[in-house]
Interface confidence: medium
């Protein structure tokens, strides 16, 4: 079996996160591994052995440093990118040489930085009417990278929850259930992140003379 | 009429696990969550823990993280609470409560659990 | 956690006279204008009884002599003119954020 590669996150860094690329590969079969980047255009095959050409011409392309591990079956070349940039993006291939053939082989792996994007939300929350008794559903989805978190406020304060006061899919989704004079005032959506925070707001005006509130 | 019907009492050895049930009728109970308070005896009351009866998403009190299982049965309307490994600490009697608005508006009997060997 | 301490933790009052308890809260259980803080009444052998929600509203069918008050952290629980089958535990609870605490619990007598 040829040279692997792994990513440490199993996942897409975005911009300023560090990742490291790992090449594993048998140390009584293999030697001399070598990290090398194929430049921005990625290359038709993305993934797996690449064909004897490239790997050929890799002696043209700038070596990458690693750092070499080894524990009692595999060596281990991690390249670690530290502060990953959009310009780090591309093919990265490591390459292993058969310690008897001295054949060449090289795995390929294409990594892709993602943008970092400041929060933004869509979704359904303007102001509105409703009745005593009734029900208020509202969605407020928050889009960004790093994913945003989304928190709720009424009247400038945080949220609070009951039986009535319901929030789901991390915190997306808004039932006000069992509407009370009470739940009238300014709602909020807030998602932040690092880059920054988004907001909607809605009020919610509450009609009807209170009832008998804890009856059903 | 709104009513919570709690399971009878309970003897438990330490270490075997307790299952309380509380049966709601009456109302619309996937509307509303359903709590469980803890009373020792001679003492005051202890919030436990909610379930919403819609999704089965809990809340649960830090302290009894790892002790009190909250489950619901939607089909029977029956809301479920497991103490594992109890102790005689654990000896209470344990209230569920139908929670109107953050208040709790109706109550089961309570059933009695005895931790003993 | 919101620690409510109520006061006195017990009180004999005569009958007709007021009964006045007290629930402190050690952070702000109001929001928005209103104040998640309830009451409740428990006699032995029985599940609490629901008396008061939202610091001072009437739950149904509790009798008007029962009156809340309060905001922020400082609540009373009012019971004028008292009467023989008052006589049982009072908690206050709160709802403003998780976990709901209980205050520990008032007891009053009637004379």
């Known amino acids: 079996r040829g040279p692997e590669i792994t990513l440490q996150p199993d996942m897409q860094p975005t911009e300023q996160e560090s990742v490291s690329l790992w090449c594993t590969a048998d140390r009584s079969t293999f030697e001399n591994l070598t990290w090398y980047k194929l430049g921005p255009q990625p290359l038709p095959i993305h993934v797996g052995e690449l064909p004897t050409p490239v790997c050929k011409n890799l002696d043209t392309l700038w070596k990458l440093n690693a750092t070499m591990f080894s524990n009692s079956t595999n060596d281990i070349l991690i390249m670690e990118l530290k502060n990953a940039s959009l310009q780090d993006q591309g093919d990265y291939v490591c390459l292993a040489q058969d310690r008897k053939t001295k054949k060449r082989h090289c795995v390929v792996r294409q990594l892709t930085v993602l943008e970092r994007v400041a929060p933004t939300i869509t979704g359904n929350l303007e102001n509105q009417t409703t009745s005593i008794g009734e029900s208020i559903e509202v969605s407020c989805t928050a889009s960004g990278n790093p994913p945003p978190q989304i928190m709720w406020f009424k009247d400038n304060e945080t949220l609070v929850e009951d039986s009535g006061i319901v929030l789901k899919d991390g915190n997306r989704n808004l039932t006000i259930r069992r509407v009370r004079k009470e739940d009238e005032g300014l709602y909020t959506c807030q998602a932040c992140s690092v880059l920054g925070c988004a907001k909607v707001e809605a009020f919610f005006i509450i009609e009807g003379a209170q009832e008998k509130t804890n009856l059903e | 009429e709104v009513q919570l019907q709690q399971s009878g009492p309970q003897l438990v050895r330490p270490g075997a696990s307790a299952k309380i049930s509380c049966k709601a009728s009456g109302y619309a109970f996937t509307t509303y969550w359903m709590h469980w308070v803890k009373q020792r005896p001679g003492q005051g009351l202890e919030w436990i823990g909610m379930?919403?009866?819609?999704?089965?998403?809990?809340k649960l009190n830090q302290r009894f993280k790892g002790k009190a299982t909250l489950t619901v049965d939607k089909s029977s309307s029956t809301a479920y609470m497991q103490l594992s490994s109890p102790t005689s600490e654990d000896s209470a009697v344990y209230y569920c409560?139908?929670?109107?608005?953050?208040?709790?508006?109706?109550w089961g009997a309570g059933t009695t659990v005895t931790v003993s060997s | 956690d919101i620690v409510l301490t109520q006061s006195p933790a017990s009180l004999a009052v005569s009958l007709g006279q007021r009964a006045t308890i007290s629930c402190r809260a050690s952070?702000?259980?109001?929001?928005?204008?209103?104040?998640?803080m309830h009451w409740y009444q428990q006699k032995p052998g029985q599940p609490p009884k629901l008396l008061i929600y939202l610091a001072s509203n009437l739950e149904s069918g509790v009798p008007a002599r029962f009156s809340g008050s309060g905001s922020g952290t400082d609540f009373t629980l009012n019971i004028h003119p008292v009467e023989e089958e008052d006589a049982a535990t009072y908690y206050c609870?709160?709802?403003?954020?998780?976990?709901?605490?209980f205050g520990g619990g008032t007891k009053l007598e009637i004379k």
């Open positions: 379930i919403d009866f819609s999704d089965s998403e809990t």
């Open positions: 409560a139908r929670d109107v608005r953050g208040n709790f508006d109706v």
């Open positions: 952070k702000s259980v109001s929001t928005s204008g209103y104040s998640y």
């Open positions: 609870q709160h709802s403003r954020e998780l976990p709901w605490t």
